[in-house]
Interface confidence: medium
């Protein structure tokens, strides 16, 4: 801790301005009043303080606000935010989206730090749910944000917020997360017509059940292979060759390149070879002609 020393004559700060960058750490401690700093926080970020000087300013704020900073100060922290620990941030009550944006801007271009993760957690918990504006903001700064949430956390996302989600925001989502997001997307986009609906729902299809894939196959959607490869294996397996052909349209030819990868590999193993042959792609590994195909789920139900 910086020891208390008297402020030299004529150096008492009357505003937060550039002259302070020439103050030594002990002079900042002695000559900058905490109340002055707090009421002029919006000026700090425009001044190129050193990291050591920022430590002194943080120390002054910590003394003034031992229970945590008020939002009027948090909003103007600027680069001082980088000095905050997750423990500091847990004391805050951040309710304004403008405050959140201001702090995310400071960390822009960097990985999500523990400080930012704590800040977002405090903000979302304070709001009670991930509303559209918050989601818009978070995904703009961190495209992978949505996929960093647990299925439980995603369950608090209202369907209306799904409109804000871009395809790249879902790139790192796993099937469990898409299982939660897909029904919300379905609900959000349900009033759109066929082609528009498919454009919007496409990114979420990794959480779609078989029945919905069958329904899509009747709508001439021409799903690309990248989307098909992200579908749930258990949802793809029951699809017939004809349904997959309709689902993929002209992209069906891409199945050949993916025949050794899931879900295509597993799907091929479930199809009759003569049905696969109708595609004319040379797909191999289907059930040979004359073999009996048992529906194991039906067999279990009967026994």
């Amino acid at each position: 801790e910086v020891e208390k020393t008297a402020c030299p004559s004529g150096k008492k700060a009357r505003e937060i301005d550039e002259s302070l960058i020439f103050y030594k750490k002990w002079e900042l401690e002695a000559c900058v009043d905490a109340a002055l700093l707090a009421t002029q926080m919006d000026r700090v970020n425009a001044i190129p303080f050193t990291y050591e000087q920022l430590d002194v300013l943080k120390h002054k704020l910590d003394e003034l606000y031992p229970q945590g900073y008020p939002e009027s100060v948090i909003q103007h922290l600027g680069y001082l935010f980088l000095k905050m620990s997750p423990e500091d941030i847990r004391k805050w009550n951040v309710t304004s989206l403008e405050t959140l944006k201001a702090l995310l801007e400071v960390n822009k271009g960097h990985e999500m730090s523990p400080q930012v993760a704590t800040l977002i957690d405090r903000f979302v918990k304070g709001r009670g749910q991930l509303d559209k504006d918050t989601l818009d903001t978070l995904t703009a700064f961190y495209p992978g944000y949505l996929c960093s949430l647990s299925p439980e956390e995603l369950s608090s996302v209202p369907p209306s917020s799904i409109w804000a989600v871009r395809p790249q925001d879902l790139d790192t989502c796993d099937p469990r997360q898409l299982d939660v997001l897909y029904p919300k997307a379905r609900l959000a986009f349900q009033n759109m017509n066929g082609s528009e609906y498919f454009v919007k729902i496409q990114s979420f299809l990794g959480g779609a059940p078989t029945e919905d894939l069958k329904a899509l196959s009747q709508q001439n959607v021409s799903m690309d292979l990248a989307t098909f490869m992200k579908l749930r294996t258990d949802a793809v397996l029951p699809l017939t060759v004809a349904e997959v052909q309709k689902l993929l349209g002209p992209h069906v030819e891409g199945l050949k390149a993916e025949e050794r990868h899931r879900p295509v590999r597993d799907w091929i193993l479930r199809q009759r070879q003569d049905d696969l042959d109708t595609l004319g792609l040379g797909l191999q590994g289907g059930i040979p002609n004359g073999y009996l195909v048992l529906d194991l789920s039906m067999q279990e139900a009967l026994s």
Epitope: R14, E15, D17, E18, D33, A34, A35, L36, A38, T39, M41, D42, R43, N45, A46, I47, L64, Y65, P66, Y69, P70, E71, S72, V73, Q75, H76
Partner: antibody
Framework: QVQLQESGPGLVKPSQTLSLTCTVS??????????WSWIRQHPGKGLEWIGY???????YYNPSLKSRVTISVDTSKNQFSLKLSSVTAADTAVYYC???????????WGQGTLVTVSS | DIVMTQTPLSLSVAPGQPASISCQSS???????????LYWYLQKPGQPPQLLIY???NRFSGVPDRFSGSGSGTDFTLKISRVEAEDVGIYYC?????????FGQGTKLEIK
């Protein structure tokens, strides 16, 4: 709606200490980062800022009055107070309390109380 | 301390006519953060001052749009596009660039 109300004696003798209290209603004095201020207005004259306090007790005073001013706060009563020592006739004024927001917006004011310094 | 000087000190305007008040500071009120810390207050007869304009040109909530502020550096202006009877009182400019905050001496607006 936040309301502020000044109270205290309207007449103080020279060399004594002027004491005023401002009671805040309709909001907490320890609310989001607000500072609480005293401003005075000499009869027929302009406004002079005296100083401000945060609910934790941290203060900032106008250097011209600093040697004579003390501002204190009582969060349990939602009040803050002004003491001005060694008063003279030049301290006769209407004293206002006001809420100070970021960037120095004095957004809520009391109605003001006239203090006369006279023997 | 920063000294604030207002002109004119009094003004008499007919209802519906425009009014303009100038305020000059002894030092620039612009900070390197881009903000300029100049405020306008109106004190109606028998009342405390009320905030009209903050940071040169931003109207405070509930302030009619006939009030506008402009200026930069050391020279600032408050304009009332069409004066109404309720606008009478004393107008003060105030700076908070540097503590202590300081007020202009006031401009008294009367209705003709």
């Amino acid at each position: 709606q936040v309301q502020l109300q000044e109270s205290g004696p309207g007449l103080v003798k020279p060399s004594q200490t002027l004491s005023l209290t401002c009671t805040v209603s309709g909001g907490s004095i320890s609310g989001d980062g607000h500072f609480w201020s005293w401003i005075r207005q000499h009869p027929g004259k302009g406004l002079e800022w005296i100083g401000y306090i945060y609910y934790s007790g941290s203060t900032y005073y106008n250097p011209s009055l600093k040697s004579r001013v003390t501002i204190s706060v009582d969060t349990s009563k939602n009040q803050f107070s002004l003491k001005l020592s060694s008063v003279t006739a030049a301290d006769t004024a209407v004293y206002y309390c006001a809420r100070l927001r970021g960037g120095y917006k004095f957004d809520y004011w009391g109605q003001g109380t006239l203090v006369t310094v006279s023997s | 301390d920063i000294v604030m000087t207002q002109t004119p000190l009094s003004l008499s305007v007919a209802p519906g006519q425009p009014a303009s008040i100038s305020c000059q500071s002894s030092l620039s009120l612009q900070h390197s953060n881009g903000k300029t810390y100049l405020y306008w207050y109106l004190q109606k007869p028998g009342q405390p001052p009320q905030l009209l304009i903050y940071e040169v040109s931003n109207r405070f909530s509930g302030v009619p749009d006939r009030f506008s502020g402009s200026g930069s550096g050391t020279d600032f202006t408050l304009k009332i596009s069409r004066v109404e009877a309720e606008d009478v009182g004393i107008y003060y400019c105030m700076q908070s660039k540097q503590l202590p905050c300081s007020f202009g001496q006031g401009t008294k607006l009367e209705i003709k």
